[in-house]
């Protein structure tokens, strides 16, 4: 028996359902009584779901997995994972045994988009050219951790005096806070871009300083 899975990682958004595709080519006369199917976590060998002795043995993994029972006899051994969490991310191995056995691993990549950045300025009044200001760009509830880029009004990257920190919440999602310290010109726009590297999603925030008032 030969097992086939997707070469590319399966990308799933947090709280959505994902299908880890796995298939085999059944011989003529194949019956489910002959099938032993096991899904497990590749690295820890933890059992996720199994089908043995002609029946679905159910989920061994937080009761959020399911097979496609009507499609098994056609060689579809795919696994449905419901309400995906950050902790589900990783490699899953599909083992199929009929008379001989084969296995293959498929990678699950979890992602969550970042919110539109909020911008704060310190100090936020009585600003004059030549003043040192701290601009903070904050974006929330994304995964995996973000890349943050700063640019001035002409699109020139600002790399000095930038400090970026990540904060993981209880669900494993990240809040990102990036701080730019800059000396004010006569007027200017400062933009931050928060990029999710998996989704290639860019979230933009900017602040324009033109004396008073400030524009966010």
């Amino acid at each position: 028996v030969e097992v086939q899975v997707s070469e590319d990682p399966v990308v799933a958004l947090v709280d959505t359902d994902a299908t880890l595709r796995c298939s085999f080519s059944p011989e003529p006369g194949f019956s489910l009584a002959q099938l032993n199917l096991i899904w497990q976590l590749t690295d820890t060998k933890q059992l996720v779901h199994s089908f043995t002795e002609g029946r679905d043995q159910g989920s061994a993994y937080s009761n959020r997995t399911a097979l496609f029972p009507d499609l098994l006899v056609q060689g579809n051994a795919s696994l449905r994972l419901q309400r995906v969490r950050v902790t589900d991310e990783g490699s899953y191995t599909c083992f199929v045994s009929i008379q001989d056995f084969d296995s293959a691993a498929v990678s699950l990549q979890v992602a969550a988009p970042y919110s539109k950045p909020s911008m704060t300025l310190e100090p936020n009044k009585d600003l004059r050219p030549g003043n040192m200001v701290t601009i903070t760009c904050s974006s929330y509830q994304g995964y995996p951790e973000a890349e943050v880029f700063w640019k001035d009004g002409q699109g020139v990257p600002l790399t000095g005096n930038v400090t970026t920190s990540q904060m993981a919440n209880e669900r494993g999602l990240f809040d990102v806070h990036s701080v730019l310290r800059v000396v004010l010109g006569a007027n200017g726009t400062y933009s931050c871009l928060v990029r999710n590297p998996v989704l290639q999603q860019d979230a933009h925030g900017s602040v324009t300083i033109t004396g008073q008032p400030l524009t966010f």
Epitope: V86, P144, A146, M167
Partner: antibody, heavy 121, light 108 residues
Framework: DVQLVESGGGVVRPGESLRLSCAAS????????MNWVRQAPGEGLEWVSR?????????YYADSVKGRFTISRDNSKNTLYLQMNSLRAEDTAVYYC?????????????WGLGTLVTVSS | EIVLTQSPGTLSVSPGERATLSCRAS??????LAWYQQRPGQAPRLLIY???SRATGIPDRFSGSGSGTDFTLTISRLEPEDFAVYYC??????????FGGGTKVEIK
């Protein structure tokens, strides 16, 4: 079994460079963030640097090494690197390669045995 | 930067007794705290993560508790191999990922 094996340590003079390697096995290397942690003689543990998983190469550094050290990884070779430039006496330490337990929880579930870097004139 | 303060610096305990180690964070880390054991001449070993979850292969005489800013590692009955240095580490807010200064558990 998970194994992390560091190499590349040695004795160098201040201002010189060194490149550390960490060969990983027993897990899907590309799926995990990796770190360097160091320990000066008789002192506690100090986190040095972290690199994101897959090929995203998002990196973080302790302030004490920023601009001098560069972390990188080669997922095809299951190897983590630390390029250390402009070395100082205070960089003398055992350098450990450590695997992040998960990509959102940066505790270190597996450590190498370490490689000693001595910076001395 | 979140600062972790461990106490006591050294704890003298007899084998078979209970040891209680403390770690205090300068600001809340929720439950994002780990404990490590380091025996002389060896690499650190993960004992506890998420404040109270035991790592794979760690005996149940090790337990962790606490959340927010105050955390405790308890070794219920000290075995000879438990005499070592113990470190806490936070991973709530980074960089940097920070460690406590360590507590040495020595034989009384």
């Amino acid at each position: 079994d998970v194994q992390l094996v560091e190499s590349g340590g040695g004795v160098v003079r201040p201002g010189e460079s060194l490149r550390l390697s960490c060969a990983a096995s027993g897990f899907t290397f590309s799926n995990y963030a990796m770190n360097w942690v160091r320990q000066a003689p008789g002192e506690g543990l100090e986190w040095v640097s972290r690199i994101n998983y897959k090929g995203y190469n998002i990196t973080y550094y302790a302030d004490s090494v920023k601009g001098r050290f560069t972390i990188s990884r080669d997922n095809s070779k299951n190897t983590l690197y630390l390029q250390m430039n402009s070395l100082r006496a205070e960089d003398t330490a055992v350098y450990y390669c450590a695997k992040s337990g998960s990509n959102s929880n940066n505790f270190f579930d597996y450590w190498g045995l370490g490689t000693l870097v001595t910076v001395s004139s | 930067e979140i600062v972790l303060t461990q106490s006591p610096g050294t704890l003298s305990v007899s084998p078979g007794e209970r040891a209680t180690l403390s770690c205090r964070a300068s600001q809340s880390v929720n439950s994002k705290l780990a404990w490590y054991q380091q025996r002389p001449g060896q690499a650190p070993r993960l004992l506890i993560y998420d404040a109270s979850s035991r790592a794979t292969g760690i005996p149940d005489r090790f337990s962790g508790s606490g959340s927010g800013t105050d955390f405790t590692l308890t070794i219920s009955r000290l075995e000879p191999e438990d005499f070592a240095v113990y470190y806490c580490q936070q991973y709530k807010n980074w960089p940097p990922l920070t460690f406590g200064g360590g507590t040495k558990v020595e034989i009384k």
